[in-house]
Each structure stands twice: as structure tokens, then as C-alpha cells.
């Protein structure tokens, strides 16, 4: 067997860092065994099998003129083996972000806090942060640890599934090359990472009859589970064209009436999600739908929702009391605030 | 023990090609270099080249290498040189040695190659 | 290339005498060089290598010596079976060079 330890990385290849002393194994040989050793390509003898040093070479101070193969043979002539010496860094701490798109799951991305110019890998993995007792850190074997899995085709990025809402978890992070490993541990709780994708399916259409509406409605995003017991609450802006400054309001379900839109202009209108308890941060906006408020007076035949309205053929002024919120079909996935309110004091 | 059996000696004709051969037997084939040397009538030895063991990764001379050619046969344990554009002055014994990766410890008998038109 | 220089290029001596050999290159090669022996209608043989490395099977009568240009194989007591050509030879680059070599015969 060779006498070589068999670092982390492609076969054949030997590792050190510059400007140390670099110790390079001859592979097909019995330890100790003398042996000689040439440059691939470079036929004057480096070390001589007369050295002391068996079947290791040393290279004092590596630079980067020392990368490249090196040939060791036996005393008789016999190919001992070839070894790449590549030179680099040993790991250092790898940088560690984690976010979450929902309550359920969380994912944690990395990347080098240094380049170690070597081959590199990572290991994943995350526990349950929980005390035991009020003088005891020992972990339970609820409490992991257990793999992150990581995505495949090399993505930096390794996702939790079925992270619960309230605990805290600690990420583990570790960089791992030829030269040695080193680790990033990340204390995380979903509801400080939790930051939802934007809302999806936004429409915004004008009243007919009014000139300066425009209902915006929209949808939860898909990644957001189904169960009713956590909401998103939303953040609406919109603006006429060419208009530097958005509007805000904060709508109380899944749509919004414009009611002080500039008449004749496109406006464009984008919205944004958050739980609706505070936790974690808004998302980013959703790509922004354009609407242009209706010119011509109320049709006869009017909208269902429109049923409750006299027949103004004239906008109301800004102070007039605006008309009674269309009703919508309850999303399916949703209730109440206050039902939900209620439901997490039940909870609790 | 080791030996290195050369093919038989050739007359070529300028211009042309030859192929020496150089069966080997006795130690492992792929763990040892081959080398190619030549020397002319009385003359000094002459180093054409080399070919690695088990890559047959190879050097040449660089006086030869637009018309030298080394190849091995692993199955036969056999190494080849071929030399072409072949002209008078080739005319030499052609040695094959296994050595190390720079030395010649073993010999073949030799191949005479004798160039004349 | 690498030019092996050996003097001289006959030497007349008698057996039992000693022989020094001399090889000179034209560029410092450390001890990147080999000496081989040559008898009439057979193939070299090595003697000594890089300098003064002896090789197993080899009279020790042969040693070798020198390092960087200049190099000398002396052979303590000559031997009839010792009357041959001996050439040096360089590894220290490509391509691998040898000396014109310097034929030993008897006075």
C-alpha cells in the first residue's frame, strides 16, 4: 500500500501552501525507501536517493515555480509514481447568509471568505437550539445535528425543510480542502429570516365610470404554504407615468381601489409582502403592472360588485366617502385577521 | 534476468522509413523508461530519445524529432522507433536501453541501419 | 545542447596502472553526470553515476569524482578486461548528451 496518505481531491495531486516547506510522497513505493526525483520534463536529478529523506522530497519555501509533476523512481530505475503539486491556502471561514420565503423551510448560501486556489468543498449541517434544563446545554437527539442537503450541480446553497416557526436553529458551515477545514457556525431563527416572496399575479384594471380608480388585485405567492395559521399582510404603491414619487397604502386583503389615480395617465402599481405579525422583513416588489383609469361614464349593465353604487356619471370628489370595498371570494388559503389573531392566541 | 531483443539489421534507401524493434522481457514493462540511442561508425553515442513507462509520454532529441516516431506495445512488452526521411548519414547501430528517467542500464544488442542508394 | 568535452582522447597505459579520465561540459551541471564503458562490438555498460554514485555490480576499483564542469573516473589498477572506449554522459538538460569518449588502450 502506498505510503502516501490520500489527500481530500483528485488522485495524484500533493498540496501545500507558498512560501512553507513542502513535503511531496512518493506513491509506489514502501516507506523509507530511497528514491530519486526529477521535474517532469527536467531531466537533472532533485534529490538523490542519498538524501535521508526515503521516499519523500522537500521543497523549502514552495513558490509557485514549484507547482507542476515531479517523477519519483526506485534506486534500481523503477517508476515510483508521479505527483502534481498544487499550491494554495487552507480554508478560512466561509461567509454565511440565510433566509427564508416561508414559515416552513429556510435555506443558508455560502461563499469564500478567502480563495484558497485549491479544490474545495463544503459540509452542511444544522441543529435544533433548545435547553434542556435550566443548568443543562445537553443536546437531545431531537435536536440534530442533521445534514443541510445541499442543491445539486455545486449551487452554494443548502435548504432546511420543515424548520419550526418559534426555534432557533444554529447552521454549521464547514469549508474543507487538502490543507485543512474550518468552520462558520450561524445562530438563525425563521422568524428574523423570514422575508416572503413578492406577491404574484398582479392586475390592475380601471373602474368603469370612474376616472380616478383603478382596482389592483393580486395573489399570494405560490411558495407560501397553504395553512391558514400564518397571513401575509401587503404594502401597495403606485404612480402615474413619468412620476418620480410612489404613493403607499397598505390594502387590508388581496386587492386595492385606487381612488386619487390621475385621470387619462397610466399609472404603474406594485406590491410588496409581509407576515402579518412583523416577522422577518417585506419582500422585494413584485414586477409592476400597468393600468390606465377608464374615461367614458358607468355602463348600463354594471359589475355585480358594482351593484351598490348609485350611477355617478362624474367622479367623487377626494373627501367624498369612497364606495363599499368590492366583496371577493375569501382566498382560499386565507382568513380573517382576526380570526387569525385569535387562532394564534390559542396557540400561545 | 533482463534482456532487450532488437529485430534484425535493415538496408534503407534515402528517403525512406525504418521501424527497429525492441522486445523486452524479464521485468515489468511499464515500470521503466525506454530509450533510443544510435552511434554512427565509429563514432560517439547519440541520445534520440525517450518514452515514459506507463504514459508513453515521450522526449525527443530535438535534432530528431521532426522524423522520429516511439511507440509501445504493453501487450508484447515491445517498444518501437521509427525513424523516417531516412539519409546517408543515418546509417548507424540503433540501440534501445531501459533505464531510469536520464540513465541507460540495460542494452539491447543493437540494429544496424545502413542508408545507401 | 550541453557539450561533454573528454580528455584525452587516447590514453596508453599499462595493467595495474591508474587511469584518470577527464570530462569538462561546456555549462555547470552540478553532478548530473554518468560514465559508461564501451568494448569492441557490444553496447555500453554504466559505470558510475551522478559523479561518484558507484553502481551495484561494478568492480570498485572504478570511481568517479568532480561536480559543476569538471569530472574525473579513475580506475585504481587497470585490469586487461578494462582496455575500451569510456564515455561520459549529461542529464542535467535535454536533449541527454555524451562525450566524444576517450578509447583506453594498452601500452
Known amino acids: 500500500s502506498s505510503p502516501c496518505p490520500q489527500a481530500w481531491g483528485p488522485p495524484g495531486v500533493q498540496y501545500g501552501q507558498p512560501g512553507r516547506s513542502v513535503k511531496l510522497c512518493c506513491p509506489g513505493v514502501t516507506a523509507g525507501d530511497p528514491v530519486s526525483w526529477f521535474r517532469d520534463g527536467e531531466p537533472k536529478l532533485l534529490q538523490g536517493p542519498d538524501s535521508g529523506l526515503g521516499h519523500e522530497l522537500v521543497l523549502a519555501q514552495a513558490d509557485s515555480t514549484d507547482e507542476g509533476t515531479y517523477i519519483c523512481q526506485t534506486l534500481d530505475g523503477a517508476l515510483g509514481g508521479t505527483v502534481t503539486l498544487q499550491l494554495g491556502y487552507p480554508p478560512a471561514r466561509p461567509v454565511v447568509s440565510c433566509q427564508a420565503a416561508d414559515y416552513e423551510n429556510f435555506s443558508c448560501t455560502w461563499s469564500p471568505s478567502q480563495i484558497s486556489g485549491l479544490p474545495t468543498r463544503y459540509l452542511t449541517s444544522y441543529r435544533k437550539k433548545t435547553v434542556l434544563g435550566a443548568d443543562s446545554q445537553r443536546r437531545s437527539p431531537s435536536t440534530g445535528p442533521w445534514p443541510c442537503p445541499q442543491d445539486p450541480l455545486g449551487a452554494a446553497r443548502c435548504v432546511v425543510h420543515g424548520a419550526e416557526f418559534w426555534s432557533q436553529y444554529r447552521i454549521n458551515v464547514t469549508e474543507v480542502n487538502p490543507l485543512g477545514a474550518s468552520t462558520r457556525l450561524l445562530d438563525v431563527s425563521l422568524q428574523s429570516i423570514l422575508r416572503p416572496d413578492p406577491p404574484q399575479g398582479l392586475r390592475v384594471e380601471s373602474v368603469p365610470g370612474y376616472p380616478r380608480r383603478l382596482r389592483a388585485s393580486w395573489t399570494y405567492p405560490a411558495s407560501w404554504p397553504c395553512q391558514p395559521h400564518f397571513l401575509l399582510k401587503f404594502r401597495l404603491q403606485y404612480r402615474p407615468a413619468q412620476h418620480p414619487a410612489w404613493s403607499t397604502v397598505e390594502p387590508a386583503g388581496l386587492e386595492e381601489v385606487i381612488t386619487d389615480a390621475v385621470a387619462g395617465l397610466p399609472h404603474a402599481v406594485r406590491v410588496s409582502a409581509r407576515d402579518f405579525l412583523d416577522a422577518g422583513t417585506w419582500s422585494t416588489w413584485s414586477p409592476e403592472a400597468w393600468g390606465t383609469p377608464s374615461t367614458g361614464t358607468i355602463p348600463k349593465e354594471i359589475p355585480a360588485w358594482g351593484q351598490l353604487h348609485t350611477q355617478p356619471e362624474v367622479e367623487p370628489q377626494v373627501d367624498s366617502p369612497a364606495p363599499p370595498r368590492p366583496s371577493l371570494q375569501p382566498h382560499p388559503r386565507l382568513l380573517d385577521h382576526r380570526d387569525s389573531v385569535e387562532q394564534v392566541a390559542v396557540l400561545a | 534476468q533482463v534482456q532487450l531483443v532488437q529485430s534484425g539489421a535493415e538496408v534503407k534507401k534515402p528517403g525512406a522509413s525504418v521501424k527497429v524493434s525492441c522486445k523486452a522481457s524479464?521485468?515489468?514493462?511499464?515500470?521503466?523508461?525506454m530509450h533510443w540511442l544510435r552511434q554512427r561508425p565509429g563514432q560517439g553515442l547519440e541520445w534520440i530519445g525517450n518514452?515514459?513507462?506507463?504514459?508513453?509520454?515521450?522526449h525527443y532529441n530535438q535534432k530528431f524529432k521532426d522524423r522520429v516516431t516511439m511507440t509501445v506495445d504493453k501487450s508484447t512488452s515491445t517498444a518501437y522507433m521509427e525513424l523516417s526521411s531516412l539519409r546517408s548519414e543515418d546509417t548507424a547501430v540503433y540501440y534501445c536501453?531501459?533505464?531510469?528517467?536520464?540513465?541507460?542500464?540495460?542494452w539491447g544488442q543493437g540494429t544496424l541501419v545502413t542508408v545507401s542508394s | 545542447d550541453i557539450v561533454l568535452t573528454q580528455s584525452p582522447a587516447t590514453l596508453s597505459l599499462s595493467p595495474g596502472e591508474r587511469a584518470t579520465l577527464s570530462c569538462r561540459a561546456s555549462?555547470?551541471?552540478?553532478?548530473?553526470l554518468h560514465w559508461y564503458q564501451q568494448k569492441p562490438g557490444q553496447a555500453p555498460r554504466l559505470l558510475i553515476k551522478?559523479?561518484?554514485q558507484s553502481i551495484s555490480g561494478i568492480p570498485a576499483r572504478f570511481s568517479g569524482s568532480g561536480s559543476g564542469t569538471d569530472f574525473t573516473l579513475t580506475i585504481s589498477s587497470l585490469e586487461p578486461e578494462d582496455f575500451a572506449v569510456y564515455y561520459c554522459?549529461?542529464?542535467?538538460?535535454?536533449?541527454?548528451?555524451f562525450g566524444q569518449g576517450t578509447k583506453l588502450e594498452i601500452k
Open positions: 536501453a531501459r533505464g531510469d528517467y536520464v540513465l541507460f542500464t540495460y
Open positions: 524479464g521485468y515489468t514493462f511499464t515500470n521503466y523508461w
Open positions: 518514452i515514459g513507462p506507463s504514459d508513453s509520454k515521450t
Open positions: 555549462q555547470s551541471i552540478s553532478n548530473n
Open positions: 551522478y559523479a561518484s
Open positions: 554522459q549529461q542529464s542535467y538538460s535535454w536533449p541527454l548528451t
